[in-house]
Structures are given as C-alpha cells and as structure tokens.
C-alpha cells in the first residue's frame, strides 16, 4: 500500500483521535517509506557483502544521486525551510527514476519494492501541497531518465547489484536528511 | 569498540580537541554523538554528525563545539572552555539503520578538567 | 524545543521489588524512545529503545512501554547488579534542544 496504515491497534479503540495534520502525515509516510528501505536493504545485504564496505570503498561510481548539502537549506546550520523544501521535493522527483530501475531487482520483496516507489509518489504529493515556491521545482527531464534507466540496466550482474545498494542506501540517507529538516518546519 | 582520547587538565580559555577512535568497523557507516557527564551530575548531549557534513548540536554548544569526520575517528573542538565544561566526554554510536536517534556502542570516556 | 522530564530523581528498593520509572516529554515523539542505565565510572549502556524493544543481551525483566508523551520503564523483579542511575533519551528531534537524555533516576537499595 501506498499510504501507511495507523501507527498501530490502538488506532482502532480510539474513535475520536483526531485526523492527522499535514506534517504528521508526511512524517509518517517518510518512516513508512524508510521501513520499506530497510526490508529490501536485508536481502541486498544478505545477497552480497557490499553493505559492509566502508562509504570510501563505494564511492566511485558515476551514479549522480541526490544528496544533501549545505547549501540547501535543510540542515540545522543555515537551515531555510523554503529552499529546503525545494531540495527535498527535486531530490525525491530526481530519486523516481532509480526507483523504477529498482523494479524487478528483488526476488522475495517484489511488492516491497513497487510499495516503496508508490509511497514515494504519494509522499512528493504530500510535500508539493506544502510548498509555496512550486515554481523553482525543476523536472527531470524524461528521455534523460529513460536513457539513464537502459545504461542502468545493460551493467553486469555485479555492477547491478552494487547499483541496487547504492541507491537504497543514498535514498535510506536522502529521506533520513529530509525527515530531520522537516521536524524542525 | 570506540575509545575517546584527548582528555586533559587546561587553563580556561584553551582551546582543547578530544578524538573517538574506532575499532573493528569503518565510522563512516554510523552516526556518531557526544555526550557529557559532570562530576555527580547526569548526561548531557552535545551534538552528532550524521554524513561527512551534516551536525546538530544542543542549543549551547553552537559556535563552541565543532565535531568532524574520518572514516576511522571523530573529533570533537572545544573554545572558550570554563570550569562549567569540566566533565567525562563519551563518544557514542548510533547505527543509522533507522530515523530515530539512540546510541547502542558508547566508548568509555575521557576526563577534560578545567581549572587555573 | 523538546525537554525531558523523568522522575523520580531517587528511589529505594530492595531485591525482588517491582521498580517503575517515568519519561515525560514536552510535546510528542512517537515512540522514539531510549533508556539507558549507567554504573558509577562506566559508560551508559543502552537497554531500550523505540520505547518497547530490549536491546541486544538485555534481561527479559526490563520492559518498557508509552508512546507521544509518557513513557515508563519497569524492572518486573530488581536484582542486586540493577542498582544503577537510568535514563531516558528522546530520538525523535536533535535540533533546537538543551538536551536529548531526561535528568535520571538513581536506583538505590533500601
């Protein structure tokens, strides 16, 4: 499912809980999302042993994924909740290409994988209703992304499999940097 | 395990750097937090470094404080210290795996004494 | 900014009691919720966390439980090495605080 169900039974002998609110949805939907992560993260780790190479050992490669900086807004020094939320929004629409290559790449956590990129759908809708500055949101564009997603997908075997783990674990780094920034709105 | 190291008598007003060391994994996989703890007091949060770049610190530490990052240490920068920073300095472990903050491997502590 | 506010400060007990401690925090957190307990000169060590789950080799006789605000942490049975200070520590915001970790509470024998 796209959207999370409530947090837990307790959700159902409380009829009168009030609705949630914006932030409390989209805080939701990132920990629905980052739960999802972490499953499809435990069949990657217990396929290969890339999870236990240090950040150095897999830093070169020329995936251009999205990552948090300074720049943005979104951490507690030089915090800016527009230009953030700008970052978070592009970021999320630049990580939905990935995500598809992402599709079929698992065995057992087939469903897990298409929920994870629904969510994410789900949860850039949430965040658009919440931002002011629409505008300075750029799209990517798609021939690009389709390009991208054919190289992706004619590697070799273990460059696919370190390609899968790189972009759970950025993504997983991505979403936590987004969920701090957002806490602090 | 981590050890903190760098702990030492100093004058107010001395600048001090005090360094978590790893051992038996890389530090750029986790999350990594300081804490304090004066004589006979509680623990006190400092602040984290999450990536290479990204930190958060408690409200008093800002401008003060400063942690940076290897792949094998982390340190924690220290100006202007006052009696009042006298205390045990822990470096602490936070796996990351998750987007709550909780501290699972903590080191044993350095004691920073700062006194004319 | 989020605050912490565990009591007691102190309690006695003896071996066998049943020993209950509070978290309250300044607005909610969900469930992002750790204890710790500390023995003179030792680091802490970490026993709870997500308000409910025991962390690795922890003794079945810590449990804990709450969620948004309150949150409690009971030892069913004290045993003599549980004498101890504990805190509480909240995971959900580390931002704009004067401190993650509630004040303690220091677990003495009667």
């Known amino acids: 499912a796209p959207v999370p169900p409530g947090e837990d039974s307790k959700d159902v002998a409380a009829p009168h809980r009030q609705p949630l609110t914006s932030s409390e949805r989209i805080d939701k939907q990132i920990r629905y999302i980052l739960d999802g992560i972490s499953a499809l993260r435990k069949e990657t780790c217990n396929k290969s042993n890339m999870c236990e190479s240090s950040k150095e050992a897999l830093a070169e490669n020329n995936l251009n994924l999205p990552k948090m900086a300074e720049k943005d807004g979104c951490f507690q020094s030089g915090f800016n909740e527009e230009t953030c939320l700008v970052k978070i929004i592009t970021g999320l629409l630049e990580f939905e290409v990935y995500l598809e290559y992402l599709q079929n790449r698992f065995e057992s956590s087939e469903e897990q994988a298409r929920a994870v990129q629904m969510s994410t759908k789900v949860l850039i809708q949430f965040l658009q209703k919440k931002a002011k500055n629409l505008d300075a949101i750029t799209t990517p564009d798609p021939t690009t992304n389709a390009s991208l997603l054919t190289k992706l997908q004619a590697q070799n075997q273990w460059l696919q499999d370190m390609t899968t783990h790189l972009i759970l674990r950025s993504f997983k780094e991505f979403l936590q940097s987004s969920l701090r920034a957002l806490r602090q709105m | 395990s981590l050890e903190e190291s760098g702990g030492r008598l100093v004058t107010p007003g001395t600048p001090l750097t005090l360094t978590c060391t790893a051992s038996g994994f890389s530090l750029s996989n986790y999350y990594v937090t300081w804490v304090r703890q004066a004589p006979g007091k509680g623990l006190e949060w400092i602040g984290i470094?999450?990536?290479?770049?990204e930190t958060a610190y408690a409200t008093w530490a800002i401008g003060r404080f400063t942690i940076s990052k290897t792949s094998t240490t982390v340190d924690l920068k220290m100006t202007s210290l006052t009696a009042a920073d006298t205390a045990t300095y822990f470096c602490a472990r936070d796996d990351s795996s998750d987007w709550d903050a909780k501290f699972n491997l903590w080191g044993q502590g350095t004691l920073v004494t700062v006194s004319s | 900014a989020i605050q912490m506010t565990q009591s007691p400060s102190s309690l006695s007990a003896s071996v066998g009691d049943r020993v209950t401690i509070t978290c309250q925090a300044s607005?909610?957190?969900?469930?992002?919720l750790s204890w710790y307990q500390q023995k003179p000169g030792k680091a802490p060590k970490l026993l709870i966390y997500?308000?409910?789950t025991l962390a690795s080799g922890v003794p079945s006789r810590f449990s804990g439980s709450g969620s948004g605000t309150d949150f409690t942490l009971t030892i069913s049975s004290l045993q003599p090495e549980d004498f101890a200070t504990y805190y509480c520590?909240?995971?959900?915001?580390?931002?704009?605080?004067?401190?993650?970790f509630g004040g303690g509470t220091k677990v003495e024998i009667k």
């Open positions: 470094i999450y990536g290479s770049d």
């Open positions: 520590q909240q995971g959900y915001s580390l931002r704009n605080i004067d401190n993650a």
């Open positions: 607005q909610s957190i969900n469930n992002e």
């Open positions: 997500r308000a409910s």
